[in-house]
Amino acid sequence: KSSNEATNITPKHNMKAFLDELKAENIKKFLYNFTQIPHLAGTEQNFQLAKQIQSQWKEFGLDSVELAHYDVLLSYPNKTHPNYISIINEDGNEIFNTSLFEPPPPGYENVSDIVPPFSAFSPQGMPEGDLVYVNYARTEDFFKLERDMKINCSGKIVIARYGKVFRGNKVKNAQLAGAKGVILYSDPADYFAPGVKSYPDGWNLPGGGVQRGNILNLNGAGDPLTPGYPANEYAYRRGIAEAVGLPSIPVHPIGYYDAQKLLEKMGGSAPPDSSWRGSLKVPYNVGPGFTGNFSTQKVKMHIHSTNEVTRIYNVIGTLRGAVEPDRYVILGGHRDSWVFGGIDPQSGAAVVHEIVRSFGTLKKEGWRPRRTILFASWDAEEFGLLGSTEWAEENSRLLQERGVAYINADSSIEGNYTLRVDCTPLMYSLVHNLTKELKSPDEGFEGKSLYESWTKKSPSPEFSGMPRISKLGSGNDFEVFFQRLGIASGRARYTKNWETNKFSGYPLYHSVYETYELVEKFYDPMFKYHLTVAQVRGGMVFELANSIVLPFDCRDYAVVLRKYADKIYSISMKHPQEMKTYSVSFDSLFSAVKNFTEIASKFSERLQDFDKSNPIVLRMMNDQLMFLERAFIDPLGLPDRPFYRHVIYAPSSHNKYAGESFPGIYDALFDIESKVDPSKAWGEVKRQIYVAAFTVQAAAETLSEVA
C-alpha cells in the first residue's frame, strides 16, 4: 500500500513530494552556517546555536519546539595551565615538550575558543616513567604483551595508537594492565591515506593534527553523576569518587609529529610482528623505556583538566501525527562539536535541518504524518551521549510505551564511496525497498538505483545480490533508545572504501581541520552524497511515520537470530571437552530460535491478510511489531552493564563502536580458558544461554495470535 493511504491527504503529499523538497544547496548553506565557530558542549556558543535551531524549526512549521536542559558532568582543559607531555632527562629537565595546540587551518587563525586537544574526563596528574608501546591497546594487544612477551605495564606510561576500537576501551585496558598514564596518538598508517595530501591541500591528517575525544567507560549510563535518572534541577548527584565510568589515570592525545619524537627513542623489545608497526620511520619497539643513549630519559605527563557540572541543551521539535499522535518516530542527531564540526556532527545536523524544512513545507500545505515525528538536536554527545541519554531517562515511560523507531543522524559522511547502514533487522526490508527507489549519486551508476551501487560496492557477506547491513554498536545517540529501551533503531551515512579501517574514523576526525572547507573542497563539492543521506534518513522517517502498517519485517529477525546462534555455538565448540564436562547445551537456544522463526512466519502471513480498515486490529498488529524490539530487553541488563539491556545486541565489551550478538553468552565465553574457576565460568555460560533462550522464546510469543 502506498503511504498516502495513511491519512486523508491529497495524493501529491506522498514520499515523492517529501523527497523532492530536499535540496543539496540548502544542506550546503546549513552546513556553512553551523560550522563557522566552535560549538563545544556546555559553551555559550552552543547554547546560542540551540536557540537558533529552535527558532528555525518553528519557522519551518513544526507544532512545537522546546529546549530541554540538564546539568551534567563535562570536562575541560585548564585555560591557564595547559596539558602537555615532555621527555625529561636524569636531572628532571624538560628536553622536549609536545605542542599545546594544533596549528589553525587557513582562514581560522583568529577564531577564539578553539579547545586544545585533550582527552575529556582525564583526571589530573603528572606521572613520569618509562614508556611502553601497546599498539592499539586492544584486549588482544595486552594479551600479546603480558602473556607472550612477558612485558609488565604496571607503573609504566603506555603509548597507544588510535584506531580499531573506541578510545575509552583502550584506556580501560591500560588501567587494568596497571599503567599510570596513557598517551594516544594518530599513526599515519591509520589516519593518512596513501596518495592524498594533508589538510589544507587534501583530506589527510597533518602531523600537528590531533584527535580529541572522551575516554569514558559509561556502558550506557549517561551523565556519570546521575546514572538511570535525568540530571534535572532536583537530581541527587553521586560524589566524584562514585561517578560512573571515569578513568583513573591521566590520558592525553598527540599528533604523529610529536609521537615520532617519543617513539623514535624507544628501546626494549622489538615489535612482535608487522601488525604492530605503523607508518612512521621509527622501530616501533615496545620498550619499556628508551634505548641505550636515552635510557636515563623518562616521559612525564602534565594534565590539569577539570570536571565540571555544566548545563546542556537539547532541542526537541514535534510534528504531531494525525491518526496515531501517541506513536513516536524520532529523528535525532547531535549539535555539539569538538571544534568546527565540519563532518561530526554538522554534516548530519545540516541534513536533519533540511529534513525538518521539507516536512514543515508539507505540513504548511495541510499534510500531517500518520504518527508523531519527534526531531532532536542533542547536546553533549561528544562527552558520552549525555544529551540524548538524559532526555530518554526523563521520558523513558513515554518512550517505552510509544516509541516506534529512532533514526540517528550524526555525520552524514565519513567518505564518499558508498552507503553504510547499521540497523535493527526489523528495518532491513524498509532500507532495501527505499534504496531501490532512490537514485545513486555514485559516478558510474548514473540512472541506477542507490540499492544497485550500494550492493555492488558493499555486498552482503551472506546473501548474494544484497548489500551489507551491519549490527548496531554504540558510540552514538541511538544507544539509549536501542540498547536500553529496545526501540527499533537505524543509522545511515556515506562511507569510505576502507574495510580494514572500519573503526578508525576518517583522517581528520575530531581535529581542528574538520571544517566546512574539508567537506566542500574534498568530500562532497556538489553535496550530492549529503542529499542522498538526507533521502535515506528522511525516507525512513517518512515511511515509519506514515505507512499504515509499520514497515518492519519480523522474519528478518528470525534469520539473524539463527545466524547469531550458529556463531556463538561455534565459539563455544572451541572447548568441546569443557562443554561435555559441564553439560553445556545450546538446545534451548536453537529451539527458541526455531519457534521464533515459525511464529514470525505465521505472523507475517496474518499481516498480509488482516482487515486494514479495522483500526483496532490494525493498531493491534502494529503494536506487536512495535513491541517486538522491546521484547528483547532484559530488565536486569547484562552482567555489570545494567544499562545495556538488549539480549541480542550490545556494544562489544572490547570496543564500544562494534556491536556484539548474544553479548551475554559471548562475554561469558571470552577468554574462558584463562579463568581461575572453570566450573563457575562455565556455569555463567549456561546461565547466559538460559537468559538468551528465554528471551528469544518470550519475544516469539509476543508475535503469537493474541487469543
Partner: antibody, heavy 120, light 112 residues
Amino acid sequence: QVQLVQSGAEVKKPGASVKLSCKASGYTFTYFDINWVRQTPEQGLEWMGGISPGDGNTNYNENFKGRVTMTRDTSSSTAYMELSRLRSDDTAVYYCARDGNFPYYAMVNWGQGTTVTVSS
Amino acid sequence: DVVMTQSPLSLPVTLGEPASISCRSSQSLVYSNGNTYLHWYQQKPGQSPRLLIYKVSNRFSGVPDRFSGSGSGTDFTLKISRVEAEDVGVYFCSQSTHVPYTFGQGTKLEIK
C-alpha cells in the same frame, strides 16, 4: 612559505673552526629535523648529521664525529653547525636542509648554501 | 655505510626524448615498517638541490608528472618521459633508511 636562509661565505685557516647558521621560517621549527649536507666536486653530496630542534637531539655521521657540533636556538628558529679543526678538504658548499618528517623522510627544503673556503 | 651507485654519470639527451637514470644500493633500503626511503634530488646549475621523488615513486609537490620513480630493494630508476630544456642539471639518488644517510655520485643530464 618555507624558507631556510643561511649565513654568508666564510674563509678560514686550517685548524680553525667555522660556525654556520640556518634561519628557518614558514613552518613550526620544532617539528622538523635540520640536516647539514656538504658538497664538494670530489666527494659529491655528504650528509654530516642532523638535529631535532624539539629536543636538541643530534645524530652525526661518524666521519665527522668529534669535529662537528650541531645546536639550535628555538627562540629565533635558527640551527647552527660548527665544524672544528678545519682542513683544506673541508672546502665545500654547506647546505642546511629541512627533513620532511612523515610521509617524506627526505630533505624537502634546502637553504641557499654557504661556501666555506679553508686556505692558509 | 650504504654505498649508492648511479649510472650513467653523464647523460646526453635530445629534447623531447625519454631519459633514464639507474641507482643501486649496497644493501636493501627497505625499512622495518615496510617503506623504502629512496629519494631523488635535482640540482640545477648554480642552485641548491631540490626534492623530486620521495620514497621511490612519489612525486614531491610541484614536480611535473613527466618525472617518475620506480624500483625496490636495491635497484631503482628515475625516468623522464620527455626531456625539456629546464631539466638540465645533476640528479642524485639518496637513501634515508640507514644512518648515515648517503647520496649517489650524481648523473649529469645535458641536452645533445
